[in-house]
């Protein structure tokens, strides 16, 4: 029962996480114009992985896609790749985990097969979550670097009469969505891996009994083999999988029409 609950919860958490990763990837607000300590402008700029947008105080919003591949920064391409890999792995993981769910009966699928599928989906969720966290973190790092560079530039070349204030960008909502979603997917994946241990059919412990035959003696020792749970005879020995929870490197996740003053 606890195994089913752990597996089900892991699936739901991962599902929410992957939905969040997809949402974050599609969102336009990866970076937003920094309004702190800036002259108040009637135009608000924000950027996503796929397009940049401008919202005027009039309410008119214009978004322009990045219609070039070669002209984009390598870091942005890397972030896109990480997020897409995360989504693809997560989607496959979800597909696999649906069939692995203990509460769903599909033909005569053995528990060992479900255990393997649960483990596979768990690993996929973990990698998917890590990809999302890595992608968002790379973008955040890029923003921080650019922020301080533009801050330094702000105070240079202002000797003349004309002031040109550079637009600085700070963390957008998508970054927080991505971090949280990546974390949830990671947690869901770990839960699936934990559930995998309990899903593997329990071994039957036989007491050591010595049978004395006329010619030679064979001693049967307890443990070591899994009891068969299929129909008909199953003479193959199934290797016990020790689904111990692997320790991952802990990754910390940090958490209108108009804006008025």
């Amino acid at each position: 029962m606890a195994v089913t609950a752990c597996q089900g919860l892991g699936f739901v958490v991962s599902l929410i996480g992957i939905a969040g990763i997809i949402a974050a990837t599609c969102m336009d607000q990866w970076s937003t114009q920094d309004l702190y300590n800036n002259p108040v402008t009637a135009v608000f700029n924000y950027q996503g992985l796929w397009r940049s947008c401008v919202r005027e105080s009039s309410g008119f919003t214009e978004c322009r896609g990045y219609f070039t591949l070669l002209g984009l920064p390598a870091m942005l391409q890397a972030v896109r790749a990480l997020m897409i890999v995360g989504i693809v792995l997560g989607a496959i993981g979800l597909l696999v985990s649906i069939f692995a769910l203990k509460c769903i009966r599909i033909g005569s699928m053995e528990d060992s097969a479900k255990a393997n599928m649960t483990l596979t989906s768990g690993i996929m969720f973990i990698v998917s979550g890590l990809c999302a966290i890595a992608g968002v973190s790379v973008f955040a790092n890029m923003l921080v670097t650019n922020f301080w560079m533009s801050t330094a530039n702000m105070y240079t070349g202002m000797g003349g009469m004309v002031q040109t204030v550079q637009t600085r960008y700070t963390f957008g909502a998508a970054l927080f969505v991505g971090w949280v979603a990546g974390g949830l997917t990671l947690i869901g994946g770990v839960m699936m891996c934990i559930a995998c241990r309990g899903l593997a059919p329990e071994e039957t412990n036989y007491k050591a009994v010595s049978y004395h035959a006329s010619g030679h003696s064979v001693a049967y020792k307890p443990g070591g083999f899994k009891a068969s749970t299929g129909f008909g005879s199953n003479t193959k020995n199934k290797k016990i999988y020790d689904g111990g929870a692997r320790t991952e490197d802990e990754v910390q996740s940090y958490p209108s029409k108009h804006d008025y003053v």
């Epitope: 002259p39 135009v43 700029n45 009039s58 309410g59 204030v165």
Partner: antibody, heavy 118, light 113 residues
């Protein structure tokens, strides 16, 4: 076609207050900012501020903070501007205007002439 | 505040002539996000409210004759009337629509020679 109808001319005593109106028609009143502009022969055109009738949010030119108060009544699609503690410097034509692309002002009221007497 | 400086303050020309007037801002009105200049040109005739001619420095408002052209970027802008008509006699104002508070130029009065 959008249209902004402003209230008539006002002759008011120094130190008093005046409240003028701007009735909007031909568009969704709650979807656009309503700006107010002051025009005097000496100072030219001066932007006072705007109100977003959708939520009542306002943004004022620092120069007019405390002097002008912008309000809106969505039920009658009317924007109001009250000017308090009137002095001779407040004698001017006041326009209401609806914003557009580029934060420009596309539709203007005909103007309300305010004359402050001693 | 952004100071808008218009020149000349008045301009006298004959009908059919090409007319240009300048508007300079103390700060850049170019938004890096969309590469648009938030400068607007208005025409005002006596006893009337201003009329929108050009927004985003160069985009002509619908219904405005194509003899009116806006140009410039950053801090220097120009309004050009390719062939002056009698109905163009008015005061022309430029406006900063980028930084609060929105500010207007003092205007250029266009008169007939």
């Amino acid at each position: 076609q959008a249209y902004l109808q402003q209230s008539g001319a006002e002759l008011v005593r120094s130190g008093a207050s005046v409240k003028m109106s701007c009735r909007a028609s031909g568009y969704t009143f709650t979807s656009h900012n309503m700006h107010w502009v002051k025009q005097t022969p000496g100072q030219g055109l001066e932007w006072i501020g705007y109100i977003y009738p959708g939520n009542g949010g306002t943004y004022y030119n620092q120069k007019f903070k405390g002097k002008a108060t912008l309000t809106a009544d969505t039920s009658s699609s009317t924007a109001y501007m009250q000017i308090s503690s009137l002095t001779s410097e407040d004698s001017a034509v006041y326009f209401c205007a609806r914003d557009y692309y580029g934060n420009s002002f596309v539709y203007w009221g005909q103007g309300t002439l305010v004359t402050v007497s001693a | 505040d952004v100071v808008m400086t218009q020149s000349p303050s008045s301009l006298t020309e004959k009908t059919g002539e090409k007319v240009s007037m300048s508007c300079k801002s103390s700060q850049s009105l170019l938004n890096s996000g969309n590469q648009k200049n938030y400068l607007t040109w208005y025409q005002q005739k006596p006893g009337q409210p201003p009329k929108l001619l050009i927004y985003w420095a160069s985009t002509r408002e619908s219904g405005v004759p194509d003899r009116f052209t806006g140009s410039g970027s950053g801090t220097d802008f120009t309004l050009t009337i390719s062939s002056l008509q009698t109905e163009d006699l008015a005061v022309y104002y430029c406006q900063n629509n980028y930084r609060y508070p929105f500010t207007f130029g003092a205007g250029t009065k266009l008169e007939l020679k």
